[in-house]
């Protein structure tokens, strides 16, 4: 759709085009399967325009339908599905708070590979915090072209 001259003067955030692209900061301590993310121009090609980070987890600030995408490559990986290290290694993206909206949005299995990637459209609400859980003991790469996580506001 065409933007009016007044709309063209507004920052993207005020138009509802919230968007974020994050890179891996670190994995959690024992018993914490979450991946912790970071973003910002000082870190390279990661950024937050609207959404924010809360202790390494992505929090949504505007209601709408979002495209959620993620790729994770394992730096420490096992190619044999029979290995105790490798099975079952899964990545789950979900709303982890508020508890009343807790739900899994994406679930992926590494099977015999060392990289997974997926995306989906889903409605998200202001205050939703997205968590990415890597179960199993394998260790993800922090290379920014191998492991990344992002959301893009698509429509109200």
């Amino acid at each position: 759709q065409r933007l009016s001259r007044a709309q063209q003067q507004l920052p993207l955030e005020s138009l509802g085009w919230d968007i974020a692209e994050l890179q891996l900061n670190h994995t959690g301590p024992q018993q914490d399967p979450r991946l912790y993310w970071q973003g910002g121009p000082a870190l390279g090609r990661s950024f937050l325009r609207g959404p924010e980070l809360d202790k390494g987890q992505l929090r949504i600030r505007r209601d709408g339908i979002y495209m959620v995408h993620i790729q994770v490559t394992l730096a420490i990986c096992s190619s044999t599905s029979t290995s105790r290290h490798h099975h079952p290694t899964t990545l789950a993206v979900g709303i982890c708070s508020p508890a009343s909206r807790s739900i899994s949005l994406l679930r992926l299995s590494f099977h015999q590979g060392c990289t997974i990637a997926s995306q989906r459209l889903t409605p998200l609400a202001r205050g939703d915090t997205l968590c990415t859980n890597l179960t199993g003991t394998l260790l993800p790469s922090r290379n920014t072209d191998e492991t990344f996580f992002g959301v893009q506001w698509v429509r109200p």
Epitope: H26, T27, G28, P29, Q30, Q31, D32, A75, I76, C77, S78, S79, S83, H85, H86, C114, T137, L138, L139, P140, S141, R142, N143, E146
Partner: antibody, heavy 120, light 108 residues
Framework: EVQLLESGGGMVQPGGSLRLSCAAS????????MSWVRQAPGKCLEWVSA????????FYAESVEGRFTISRDNSKNTLYLQMNSLRAEDTAVYYC?????????????WGQGTLVTVSS | EIVLTQSPGTLSLSPGERATLSCRAS???????LAWYQQKPGQAPRLLIY???SRATGIPDRFSGSGSGTDFTLTISRLEPEDFAVYSC?????????FGCGTKLEIK
Amino acid sequence: EVQLLESGGGMVQPGGSLRLSCAASGFTFSTYAMSWVRQAPGKCLEWVSAISGSGGRTFYAESVEGRFTISRDNSKNTLYLQMNSLRAEDTAVYYCAKHDYSNYPYFDYWGQGTLVTVSS
Amino acid sequence: EIVLTQSPGTLSLSPGERATLSCRASQSVRSTYLAWYQQKPGQAPRLLIYGASSRATGIPDRFSGSGSGTDFTLTISRLEPEDFAVYSCQQYGDLPFTFGCGTKLEIK
């Protein structure tokens, strides 16, 4: 300057235990995964164990699994290897080694090693 | 487990000559995740090459790595006296991480 200093090696009888330490300095220790690598006298290098920067994920070679435990104390910038049920074939120089920032287990810095001798 | 076989076991050359060291894997190494190390007697290994061909920080450009799949090569274009040592390869694409048993580069 990155420095890794191992300690805790020595002579022990078969079935005994030892705890190795590796004191790290010159980098943000908690950011990096770490490994132990050993080398028996006149033999090849052998990877033993690895641990993520937070300490939440650990990895072991089959030859030591169930007997050795890797851990770290990020507040003390120290890596540990608890070695139980030691065997003659565990005799080696044990090195601690730092992973690349990406987490990939190639080792850009190594300590000078500590000798463990298992003998009756 | 990926077994790495290095050849030759010993290589006798003179300073100024070119050295070519081989590392062969028993199965394909994921994404060229292979490193080379130099080790001198009584010392810890020193990283030379990672990702099969990327030089580590501070490594002179006479050291170069190449290869993919199961066959990898470390080349020292012009040997300096300080280059005589043992050279080991390591794959880090698959658990467990494994090392070759080394090529000893000695002065002829």
